[in-house]
């Protein structure tokens, strides 16, 4: 196999008895993406697969970047918070049991939620064989794979390969269509010697040789262009050091009252379980760990406040206190922990060192192609397409990997709008009531009528503002029974949600400005009722007078209209959103400084922003009754987050509104919190922390969609599968490995 040139078969070349291509899912644990480029000459077989088939620059693991969570994510398409295997070690208060890789408890089906690939295949009449895979020797939903092997790490790799080849030799009626194969390397060697070590180099040669044996065996059976093979890893690997340790004893006078899952992705819970599990004061722990040292190498979070892109909160097994640890550092209880040096993983899945490999080859895959990175939650849908079966519900976005396939099996379409919009029409030039709003600059009713008339756009003006400010179409509302209306302005368009009494979204385009100076200040102390919105559906300005620590923010920044006259279009109740005062500082800095910078760098950006309500922190928009549970003496709900989606043209010679090809996206989902303690901003100017904070909360457009019930880019003329690629793209700014 190795000596031959790449075959370019136009259709599957399967021998007699193989009606449809088998699928082999092959995992090499801890194979970080960088190994593939650094040590390619030492891995001729894997390198040939990379050259001849399709590969991604890397595949993103899910957080925490550990073995069991990611292997099970790959075969379910579910986030760890959804499938339940949230770490290699965990406690479930409902089961009152501990899960670990060294205990038989791991084979209790109660831990394993979701539907793994082998069951999906079997439920649809196909046989499945697993040569090791986390979960494969567990009776999930009462069933095992058709063929499985009890885990035994001492079985030589060659023996594993020859067994799989024997399965391929089975008579057609007994032969599986789906296979898994698992190697512990290069992970074991990476832990022992670190990622840059002779041990890893040796391990890479060993796994490459075994992989070559598989490909040669397929060739001998004339299956090398029949089988669809996916070679991937669960996560990467990074170096750790014994002088890069954070000890909890440096932060607490005593530590015996809590239990800590130590390492690169630490969690803290009560020591006395189950008794103290729910009463444990997680907030106090996070307070005691926040902003304690100038060079602190972890950030403490309550899990609901973690970046939403991690989807690591909604499971009782995820302890409420979480430490987000710097690259190559470890957080542990005390100096008695000497488990350092060598390699480790589990860190932030944006770190380049945590990136995993993905390569694929076979009749269904494109050839000699490199694709952009994607997340491992997408692999399950891809495998279902290869097997031509229906996936179980999962967190992947079906169709987002269609560009890997010669002929896609599943054709996605845009979601149908669920709640139709109306237009909040202009009828009364003078408000029927003030809503307790004041604008001293507007001295009399003539002036008030004059500025209100500016909200009364002609059809031509509406067409013009839509073209510029909604270049990819208005966001469609996928939530049920959401009474909302469109509000058109010359400089922005918004979708006003009557139930929330605030805009659900606001869309505007910031051009590339010759003048990159910060925006001028907003006209002060000037607010008025929007005459287009019924007062009974509006916020009252008096809502913000009470001592609530809450002030009004503007979704569309009024100062974007650089003249005070045009600012009046934005100084209206329909543009108000409730914001904590500390949050607003950051919000205002982003809009007055950073947004101008982005627009300058990208030849203009379209901005869509709005509130998010995710009180139950499940990553999906809350039902109305969930939101109302959290109202305190108000009928204006306080958002849990705000989103901002920046869209520009990939080809920077075009503006967003005239973009013929691919778009570039930069979405943010910023937790709406009463303080900025996450950034330790004391005594620091905004320039030193706001951008870093926004960057920490970058997300996918898809994450924004799930949290808002909105659907973006429906009017962008581009195949839907390409739009889904855009929506599942996560911008990253990590440069060092």
């Amino acid at each position: 196999w190795l000596e031959e040139n790449c075959d370019t078969a136009q259709q599957s070349q399967c021998p007699e008895g193989f009606d449809l291509p088998p699928v082999i899912l092959f995992s090499m644990d801890g194979f970080r993406a960088e190994y593939l480029y650094t040590w390619d000459t030492l891995m001729p077989n894997i390198n040939k697969l990379k050259t001849c088939g399709i590969h991604s620059k890397y595949m993103r693991a899910m957080y925490p970047t550990k073995t069991f969570p990611n292997h099970y994510t790959i075969v379910t398409g579910l986030y760890p918070e959804s499938h339940g295997i949230i770490d290699n070690n965990m406690y479930d208060v409902n089961l009152n049991k501990n899960f670990s890789l060294s205990s038989k408890e791991q084979n209790n089906p109660a831990w394993w939620h979701g539907q793994p690939m082998w069951l999906t295949a079997m439920y649809q009449g196909l046989k499945a064989a697993t040569y090791f895979w986390p979960g494969s020797e567990v009776a999930i939903n009462g069933s095992f794979p058709s063929i499985y092997m009890p885990y035994n790490g001492s079985v030589p790799f060659e023996e594993r390969i020859s067994t799989l080849l024997k399965w391929l030799d089975l008579p057609k009626a007994e032969r599986p269509r789906f296979y898994t194969m698992y190697f512990e390397e290069p992970d074991s060697s990476g832990h022992a010697g670190g990622p840059v070590s002779a041990r890893v180099i040796k391990a890479l040669q060993v796994v490459d040789h075994a992989f070559g044996m598989l490909m040669e065996g397929l060739k001998q059976r004339n299956l090398h262009n029949c089988v669809n093979i996916i070679l991937l890893a669960d996560h990467g690997m990074d170096q750790t050091y014994c002088n890069k340790m954070e000890y909890m004893t440096d932060y607490f006078p005593r530590i015996n009252f809590f239990y800590m899952y130590e390492g690169p992705a630490p969690r803290i819970r009560a020591h006395n379980i189950p008794h103290d599990f729910f009463s444990f004061n997680s907030e106090e722990i996070v307070r005691n760990l926040s902003c304690r040292k100038p060079d602190q190498h972890f950030k403490p979070y309550l899990t609901p406040d973690l970046p939403k892109r991690l989807h690591y909160a909604k499971n009782v097994r995820i302890d409420k206190v979480h430490l987000f640890v710097d690259q190559q550092w470890l957080a542990v209880r005390s100096k008695s922990n000497t488990n350092c040096g060598g390699g480790n993983h589990g860190y932030n899945n944006e770190f380049r060192s945590m990136e995993a490999i993905f390569l694929a080859h076979g009749p269904s895959f494109k050839e000699k192609t490199e694709v952009e990175p994607f997340e491992n939650i997408e692999v399950y849908n891809l495998m279902c397409d290869l097997l031509r079966i229906q996936p179980a519900p999962n967190n992947g976005t079906h169709g987002s990997l269609n560009h890997l396939l010669k002929v896609p099996f599943y054709e996605p379409s845009h979601a149908e709008e669920v709640s139709k919009f109306s237009v909040c029409g202009f009828a009364n030039p003078l408000p029927t009531e003030s809503l307790d709003c004041f604008c001293p600059h507007l001295q009399n009713s003539t002036q008030l009528e004059q500025v209100n008339q500016m909200l009364n756009l002609t059809q031509e003006e509406i067409t013009a503002t839509v073209k510029v400010n909604l270049p990819f179409g208005r966001p469609r509302v996928l939530q049920k029974n959401v009474d909302h209306c469109l509000l058109y302005h010359r400089e922005y368009v918004s979708g006003f949600g009557k139930a929330m009494r605030m805009p659900m979204w606001s869309s505007y385009t910031v051009p590339q400005l010759g003048d990159t100076s910060p925006l001028p200040p907003t006209v002060p102390d000037c607010l008025r009722a929007d005459v287009r919105v019924p007062p009974s559906e509006s916020q009252k300005c008096s809502f913000y007078l009470a001592d609530k620590n809450i002030t009004h923010g503007f979704l569309y920044p009024p100062a974007s209209n650089r003249t005070s006259d045009s600012q009046y279009d934005a100084l209206i109740t329909s543009n108000l959103v409730p914001m904590y005062e500390e949050f607003r500082k950051m919000w205002d800095y982003f809009h007055s400084v950073l947004l101008i910078k982005h627009a300058t760098e990208r030849n203009g950006v379209n901005v869509v922003s709005g509130p998010i309500f995710d009180y139950n922190y499940d990553g999906h928009f809350d039902a109305p009754d969930e939101i109302t549970k959290h109202l305190a003496n108000t009928d204006v709900p306080i958002p849990t987050h705000y989103f901002v989606v920046l869209t520009s043209c990939k080809n920077k010679s075009h503006t967003p509104e005239n973009c013929p090809g691919w778009l570039d996206v930069l979405p943010f989902i910023i937790p709406h919190r009463p303080t900025n303690v996450e950034s330790c901003p004391e005594g620091k100017p905004e320039a030193l922390w706001v951008e870093e904070r926004f960057t920490a909360h970058i997300a996918r457009v898809r994450d924004v969609e799930l949290l808002t019930g909105l659907d973006f880019y429906q009017d962008k003329v581009q195949p839907v599968s390409e739009i889904l690629q855009l929506k599942t793209y996560l911008p990253t700014f990590e440069t060092t490995i």
């Epitope: 029927t432 009974s536 109302t628 003496n633 108000t634």
Partner: antibody, heavy 120, light 107 residues
Framework: QVQLQESGPGLVKPSETLSLTCTVS????????WSWIRQPPGKGLEWIGY???????NYNPSLKSRVTISVDTSKNQFSLKLSSVTAADTAVYYC??????????????WGQGTTVTVSS | DIQMTQSPSSLSASVGDRVTITCRTS??????LNWYQQKPGKAPKLLIY???SLQSGVPSRFSGSRSGTDFTLTISSLQPEDFATYYC?????????FGPGTKVDIK
């Protein structure tokens, strides 16, 4: 189904405070606006105000200085207090539930009303 | 404030008649108008919400419509149980005002 029942004294002296309670049974007080409406003898309906289950209120400006509407979710009750009453406050007082979504605050469930007379 | 006028203030009709009651508002209030029926000694009952939507359980002979600031309640074929006073109510402003009422009695 949801039922509302007003309770409170039928006779109040001038300058005193009128206090009524509305008990909600057969359903939750959550997610609705709870209103008080009155009807003087032989006259039309006058809206007094509402309280949202979360506690936020909205009052008829003509009564705002004298009226307080509050909610007690634990008891599934809301109440009306009208201070400094005069004979002009004599009326049948109704409590009602207003539904906002798509009902545009339509008052779909009413109590049977209680007559309050202001007299010394 | 939004002023509400109802016409006629009273009308006499026979069973089977088509009856139309009009409510006019001083401002454009979109569809923020509800109609209620009240019988002597009883609490009002919601008939129509959002100008034209029939409240569940209300007979289909009742209908509502809007033309600008004029709102109409129509009873297509008057029944004996329909003799009552009818009120419109606006919920556009934060002060929910009722119209003065229209009394429908037997001719």
């Amino acid at each position: 189904q949801v039922q509302l029942q007003e309770s409170g004294p039928g006779l109040v002296k001038p300058s005193e405070t009128l206090s009524l309670t509305c008990t909600v049974s057969g359903g939750s007080i959550s997610s609705y606006y709870w209103s008080w409406i009155r009807q003087p003898p032989g006259k039309g309906l006058e809206w007094i105000g509402y309280v949202y289950f979360s506690g936020s209120t909205n009052y008829n400006p003509s009564l705002k200085s004298r009226v307080t509407i509050s909610v007690d979710t634990s008891k599934n009750q809301f109440s009306l207090k009208l201070s400094s009453v005069t004979a002009a406050d004599t009326a049948v007082y109704y409590c009602a539930r207003a539904t906002r979504d798509y009902y545009y605050y339509g008052m779909d469930v009413w109590g049977q009303g209680t007559t309050v007379t202001v007299s010394s | 404030d939004i002023q509400m006028t109802q016409s006629p203030s009273s009308l006499s009709a026979s069973v089977g008649d088509r009856v139309t009651i009009t409510c006019r508002t001083s401002h454009d209030i979109s569809n923020y108008l509800n109609w209620y029926q009240q019988k002597p000694g009883k609490a009002p009952k919601l008939l129509i919400y959002a100008a034209s939507s029939l409240q569940s359980g209300v007979p289909s002979r009742f209908s509502g419509s809007r033309s600008g600031t004029d709102f109409t309640l129509t009873i297509s074929s008057l029944q004996p149980e329909d003799f009552a006073t009818y009120y419109c109510q606006q919920t556009y402003s934060t002060l929910f005002t009722f119209g003065p009422g229209t009394k429908v009695d037997i001719k």
